[in-house]
């Protein structure tokens, strides 16, 4: 995690960047032209409920999954997302070990589930903020 506490404005800037990156990474993975993504509603939030860091991404929960899928993506964007998530990781809890499924179909589902969840979560929050401010 980071050595110093990030300011709220810095956190927001990283979140906005992650929102754009996650969408691009998803498009890259699907070899997709820019278009409307199916929105997976009703998924667990990717944001922390920690009163110490309100509005911050729940990095400690997301990082292990991104670290697990990153080698399969072979994409600089995923490495950069991991770097940014690391900056937002204020919890010093031991990291959960996440392993990739060995079955090809299950691996594809696993990767796409993580990418869509993260991208949709950030997108949903951005829309929510846009409507409320």
């Amino acid at each position: 995690g980071p050595i110093y506490q990030l300011q709220p404005k810095e956190i927001q800037a990283i979140i906005v960047e992650l929102q754009n990156l996650s969408k691009k990474l998803l498009d890259d993975y699907l070899n997709k032209e820019k278009g409307v993504q199916k929105f997976d509603s009703d998924l667990p939030s990717c944001f922390t409920s920690d009163s110490q860091a309100p509005g911050n991404i729940n990095s400690s929960a997301i990082l292990p999954y991104f670290k697990a899928i990153s080698p399969s993506l072979n994409n600089d964007k995923s490495l950069y997302i991991i770097e940014q998530l690391d900056k937002l990781n204020f919890q010093n809890a031991p990291e959960t070990e996440v392993s990739m499924p060995t079955d090809n179909f299950e691996r594809k589902r696993f990767i796409l589930t993580i990418l869509r969840w993260f991208s949709n979560c950030l997108e949903h929050r951005a829309q929510h903020h846009h409507h409320h401010h």
Epitope: K38, L43, L112
Partner: antibody
């Protein structure tokens, strides 16, 4: 909008083979798997198998592995299912259906009615 | 293979009545990564192809009327139609998408009295 176009009907002789087509439009063909299902008259649905158009990875229901062969043509966004050594038991409606692997099968073709008769 | 069991096989109800049908799987369909059950419900009207109603056991597909509700988790699932309309005459199938082969239930035929 998403469309999966299938020929309405095929009539073939017993012992012959047939190649059923499913032309996809309205979405990125390689971003979704394609499923095939069989439905005999008045019966339920049977899952035949699925193919990933991006790399042609295939998974079959073991019941159909010697009967069906799934392929795709990316250039025309078309999925195919070849059925071999046809008998009257193969007479059925065959559906192609788009598979979103995160959620479910979300769009179905209209189905091709296959009649195997001499 | 995962076995999907649906009940009843058929039922006849009057317009406006509430209907529930059951689907049971031989193993849990809960996907731990997103805590979603890979269970879908399809409606097949006479002479038509199936149409997606519900996915993830309880998420209504866009455009599906609110009278259709899916519930359940693990191995036991239910489709409820809160107030049946004449256009609901159809066969309803559940399908597991947890692992291939993606098996279907045998269907529940809904008839209107």
């Amino acid at each position: 909008q998403v469309q999966l176009q299938q020929p309405g009907a095929e009539l073939v002789r017993p012992g012959a083979s047939v190649k059923l087509s499913c032309k996809a439009s309205g979405y990125t063909f390689t971003s979704y798997w394609m499923n095939w299902a069989k439905q005999r008259p008045g019966q339920g649905l049977e899952w035949i198998g699925m193919i990933d158009p991006s790399d042609s990875e295939i998974h079959y229901n073991q019941v159909f592995k010697d009967k069906a062969t799934l392929t795709v043509d990316k250039s025309s966004s078309t999925a195919y299912m070849q059925l071999s050594s046809l008998t009257s038991e193969d007479s059925a409606v065959y559906y192609c259906a788009r598979q979103d692997i995160v959620t479910t099968v979300d769009y179905w073709g209209q189905g091709t009615t296959l009649t195997v008769s001499s | 293979d995962i076995v999907m069991s649906q009940s009843p096989s058929s039922l006849a109800v009057s317009v406006g009545e509430k209907v529930t049908m059951s689907c049971k799987s031989s193993q849990s369909l809960l996907y731990s990564i997103n805590q979603k059950n890979h269970l879908a419900w399809f409606q097949q009207k006479p002479g038509q192809s199936p149409k997606l109603l519900i996915y993830w056991a309880s998420t209504r597909e866009s455009g599906v009327p609110a009278r259709f509700t899916g519930s359940g988790s693990g191995t036991d699932f239910t489709l409820t139609i809160s107030s049946v309309k004449t256009e609901d005459l159809a066969v309803y199938y559940c399908q597991q998408g947890y692992t291939y082969p993606f098996t279907f239930g045998s269907g529940t035929k809904l008839e209107i009295k």
